[in-house]
């Protein structure tokens, strides 16, 4: 269980409408409640069944919420972050960071600045380039036969 765990990191803008049971998710984190080591960011800890977030389907447990209605969530006390969500109004815009594990190993989150959180384009671009080079080399080889 000690193998390196890499992540594809993607960001998404999620617009939620506060439903009859609210936004329908819980959060952890903050400068006074670091839930992820070396990271005081705000993370989704639970999504309520049939709540607004669950019905929308895009927000996932473990997602990091970067901003609410354009307001950055960096360096906030936990309760201040909670109050921000509770007072965000009827239409709520969330900037969210998803992290998808791309290699077998223990599931977890990396802190900010951890080099193993790899943006998706940094994985896909080299793969695409290698594929193109291999195809070109194969065609040249066939021509020489």
């Amino acid at each position: 269980m000690n193998g390196r765990v890499d992540y594809l990191v993607t960001e998404e803008e999620i617009n939620l409408t506060r439903g009859p049971s609210g936004l329908g998710f819980n959060i952890v984190g903050g400068t006074d409640q670091q839930y992820v080591s070396n990271d005081s960011g705000i993370y989704v800890s639970r999504i309520k069944e049939n709540g607004a977030a669950a019905l929308d389907g895009r927000l996932q447990e473990g997602d990091k919420i970067l901003s609410v209605n354009g307001q950055d969530l960096k360096n906030l006390l936990h309760q201040d972050a909670v109050d921000l969500f509770r007072n965000a109004g009827y239409a709520v815009s969330l900037r969210v960071q998803h992290r998808l594990q791309v290699q077998n190993g223990p599931i977890g989150h990396r802190g900010e600045g951890d080099p193993s959180g790899i943006p998706i384009f940094m994985v896909l671009v080299p793969v695409f380039a290698l594929t193109m080079v291999a195809a070109w080399a194969f065609m040249r080889y066939r021509q020489q036969l």
Epitope: N26, V28, Q33, S45, H78, V82
Partner: nanobody
Framework: QVQLVESGGGLVQAGGSLRLSCAAS????????MGWFRQAPGLERDFVAE????????GYADSVKGRFTISRDNAKNTVYLQMNSLKPQDTAVYYC?????????????????????WGQGTQVTVS
């Protein structure tokens, strides 16, 4: 995984007081929102009160505001419900509940679906 054990229930006369306790076992107790619910015979389990991770944020059902007070001691992994001016309609089984993190909605919205872990309940009877 959190295990919850309630205590402090009993029989009390109208106008009297009781203090319920809920002892939690498991890691990171302070990261949990804790709540109290109650269920009278034949009725749904209703929200009573909840308290945020640090104790700074609390919410109450309208029916108990001004009479009940929820508190927690993270060093003891325990949450309390002080019940004063009890009425016969407060008779019910009282359940302690826990959920990881803080709900992003006010407690006006709270239902039993918002909590994942439950105690076995303690009976409160007001005569």
């Amino acid at each position: 995984q959190v295990q919850l054990v309630e205590s402090g229930g009993g029989l009390v006369q109208a106008g009297g007081s009781l203090r319920l306790s809920c002892a939690a076992s498991g890691p990171t107790f302070s990261s949990y929102t804790m709540g109290w619910f109650r269920q009278a015979p034949g009725l749904e389990r209703d929200f009573v009160a909840e308290i945020g991770w640090s104790g700074g944020s609390t919410g109450y059902a309208d029916s108990v505001k001004g009479r009940f007070t929820i508190s927690r001691d993270n060093a003891k992994n325990t949450v309390y419900l002080q019940m004063n001016s009890l009425k016969p309609q407060d008779t019910a089984v009282y359940y302690c509940a826990a959920v990881i993190g803080s709900p992003t909605d006010y407690s006006d919205y709270r239902s039993s679906l918002d909590y994942d872990y439950w105690g076995q309940g303690t009976q409160v009877t007001v005569s």
